[in-house]
Amino acid sequence: IWELKKDVYVVELDWYPDAPGEMVVLTCDTPEEDGITWTLDQSSEVLGSGKTLTIQVKEFGDAGQYTCHKGGEVLSHSLLLLHKKEDGIWSTDILKDQKEPKNKTFLRCEAKNYSGRFTCWWLTTISTDLTFSVKSSRGSSDPQGVTCGAATLSAERVRGDNKEYEYSVECQEDSACPAAEESLPIEVMVDAVHKLKYENYTSSFFIRDIIKPDPPKNLQLKPLKNSRQVEVSWEYPDTWSTPHSYFSLTFCVQVQGKSKREKKDRVFTDKTSATVICRKNASISVRAQDRYYSSSWSEWASVPCS
Amino acid sequence: RNLPVATPDPGMFPCLHHSQNLLRAVSNMLQKARQTLEFYPCTSEEIDHEDITKDKTSTVEACLPLELTKNESCLNSRETSFITNGSCLASRKTSFMMALCLSSIYEDLKMYQVEFKTMNAKLLMDPKRQIFLDQNMLAVIDELMQALNFNSETVPQKSSLEEPDFYKTKIKLCILLHAFRIRAVTIDRVMSYLNAS
C-alpha cells in the first residue's frame, strides 16, 4: 500500500480467483484513543472499533472511503483504491490502446517545435467518475523539471455504438534550449482513477522524436502564362522554431482530387514555393517536416485549384 | 559563443554540401545497423544515449544562432575555446566566434573518426562478419574535415590488446551512430544557418 495523495491510498493486488488479497491497517488521524468506530462509504454498519482498523482487501467491495467517528463526529477519512496486477501485468482498463505507432500505446505526445512545450493525449470510453493527474520530468534518476497543466476533456467522438472521450494535457520543460541535443528522455506519468480503480500509464520520448510542425500558412497560387502550371507559395507556420535558417523545414506539395485514389502531381522541396500542374476540381496541398530530423509530417494546408 | 549574422559567404557552400552528405551517410549507416543488428538493442528506445564529445567540445553552445543567445537555457555551459582558421570561412571578416564554432565541429568529426576506425578494425575481426562501417560514411567525414581545413593534433588510433567482445562492440556501434546522427543534425543546422547568414 502507498499514499497517492493526502488520505488517498493505493492497494496493489495480485488479481486472480481466490487470491488472498492484502492486509491493510488503517489508523485514525486523531489524538483520541477511545470510543472510535469505523464505517465504509455511506454505510452506517460499524466495521470495527479502536484507533486502528485491520482489513483484508481482496476486491473492489473492500475498497472505498473508510471513516473513523467518535460520538457521531467524523475524525478522519482514508480512501482506498485498488491497482490490479493480472499475470504480473498491471491492468490498463481505463485507457484505450491507440495502437499507433505501436501496440500498447496509451499516451500519445506531440510537439509543434523545439521550445520544450508538448501536448499529450489519451482516449477512454468512460464518461463519469474519472480523474487524471499528470507528472513529467526530463530523465528519471536525476529528474529535471517539466511543468504540466491539468488534464482536460478535449474531444468527444462517436465510435460505432459507444462514445470515445479524448483527454489532453500541455506540458512545458522548465529550462529548454531549442538547439540542445537531448540525451535524457522526457518521462510522462499519468495517474488515472475510475471509481475505486487506480491505474498508471507512462510514456518516454525525446522532443525531437515527437515533433509535428503545424501546417504551412498563407498558401497562394499564381498561374503561369501559357502553361498548365501554377506556382504555389507558402510560409513557415508561426509556431515553428526560429531562426528558420537553423530550424529548416522541407515540404511536400501535392495536387489531388477529392478521392485518394485519383491521380496526382507531387513534388518535394526545401523552398517555400513550387510549380505544379493544377487540374479542375483538384486541390493543392502542402505539408511540412523538419528538414534534418525526419519525425512526423504536419497536417496538410490546402487551397482549391480553381 | 554565438554565430554573428555575417555577410553571405561563398566559402560556406562546400561545407553545407558536405554536411548534408554527412547526415545522409550516418542516417543510412544507422538504418543499416538497425536492420542488420535486429536482435541487438539498437533502437533509440533501447540504447543509452552517450556523447563521446561531452566536456571535450562545445559545438551546440559555440554554434548557437544569434537569435537563441537571449535564451538563458542555451547559455549554461560555454567554456571551451579553439582558435584556428578554416577554409570554409573563406572571408577574413569571419569572426573569432564562427572560427570557434567550426573548429568545434572539426574536433567532433576527428573524435568520431577515430572511434569509428577503431571500431571497424574490431568488427573486421568478427568471424560472423555481420556488420562493417560504411566506407562512404568514413569518406564523407574525411571530406567535411578537409573542407573545414583546421590544423589539429592527430589523435592516435586506439589499439586494444585484449580480445574484442563483438557483442559489446556492436552495441557500442549503435550508441555511437545514434549520437553521431544527432551531432550531424546539429552540424547541418549550423551550416544551413551560416549559409543563409
Epitope: 522541407t250 485514389r261 491521380k263 507531387r266 513534388v267 518535394f268 500542374i277 487540374r279 479542375k280 | -
Partner: antibody
C-alpha cells in the same frame, strides 16, 4: 493487370510524320497520366510529353514543342503520339508509360521502333 | 533544363558483390529522383521512387538514398538477373530528364 500495347514498327521518310498508338488495358484509362519517352539506338531515355486523358491537358518538352502532338481517345482507351517534320535523328524506340503520379512512370509499353530514312 | 549525370557509365561487378551507382543533379532537386532498370530489348522498370521509396515486387537488395544533388542506387548483392542498364530520372521540374544510364556488367 495493367498493360500498355503499342502499334508496330514504322519506317518513315525525312520530313514526314508518324503517329504511334498505345492501347491501355486494366484499370480506368482516365485515372492515369500517359507519357511518351523515346530512346535512340544505344542511347538513353528522353521524355517527350504527357497527356491527362480525362481532360486532354498536355505538356511537352521544349525540345519537341511544335513538332509533337499527344492525344487520347477515352472510348478506346488509346493514346497517340504524332511527331512531324521527321529527321534521321528521330530514329528511336518510342515508348508510352503511365502512372497515377504525374512525374514518374510505373507501367511501360513495349516500345515502337520508328526508323527515319530516305 | 536540369542535367542528370550518372557515374560510372559502365560498372563491372562480380555476382554476389554489392554495386553502387551515383546520380548527380545540376541543381538541388530535394528527393524528386526515381530509378529504373532496363534490360536489352525491354522497356524500363521502376525500382525506386522519390529517392528511397521501395516498390512492391522489387527485391529488397535494391535501395536508394540521397537528397539535394547527390543520389545513390545500391544493389546489396548482385544477382545474375540484375545485370542491366540503370537510369535515374528527376521530377523536380519539367521537362523531366534522365541520366545517361549506367551499364552494370559481369566482371
Amino acid at each position: 493487370q495493367v498493360q500498355l500495347v503499342q502499334s508496330g514498327a514504322e519506317v518513315k521518310k525525312p520530313g514526314s510524320s508518324v503517329k504511334v498508338s498505345c492501347k491501355a488495358s486494366g484499370g480506368t484509362f482516365s485515372d492515369y497520366y500517359l507519357h511518351w519517352v523515346r530512346q535512340a539506338p544505344g542511347q538513353g531515355l528522353e521524355w517527350m510529353g504527357w497527356i491527362d486523358p480525362e481532360n486532354g491537358d498536355t505538356e511537352y518538352a521544349p525540345k519537341f514543342q511544335g513538332r509533337v502532338t499527344i492525344t487520347a481517345d477515352e472510348s478506346t482507351s488509346t493514346a497517340y503520339m504524332e511527331l512531324s517534320s521527321l529527321r534521321s535523328e528521330d530514329t528511336a524506340v518510342y515508348m508510352c508509360a503511365r502512372n497515377k503520379e504525374l512525374r514518374y512512370f510505373d507501367v511501360w509499353g513495349q516500345g515502337t521502333l520508328v526508323t527515319v530514312s530516305s | 533544363d536540369i542535367v542528370m549525370t550518372q557515374s560510372p557509365l559502365s560498372l563491372p561487378v562480380t555476382p554476389g558483390e554489392p554495386a553502387s551507382i551515383s546520380c548527380r543533379a545540376s541543381q538541388s532537386i530535394s528527393i524528386n529522383l526515381h530509378w529504373y532498370q532496363q534490360k536489352p530489348g525491354q522497356a524500363p522498370r521502376l525500382l525506386i521512387y522519390f529517392a528511397s521509396q521501395s516498390i512492391s515486387g522489387v527485391p529488397s537488395r535494391f535501395s536508394g538514398s540521397g537528397s539535394g544533388t547527390d543520389f545513390t542506387l545500391t544493389i546489396s548483392s548482385l544477382q545474375p538477373e540484375d545485370f542491366a542498364t540503370y537510369y535515374c530520372q528527376q521530377s523536380n521540374s519539367f521537362p523531366l530528364t534522365f541520366g545517361q544510364g549506367t551499364k552494370v556488367e559481369i566482371k
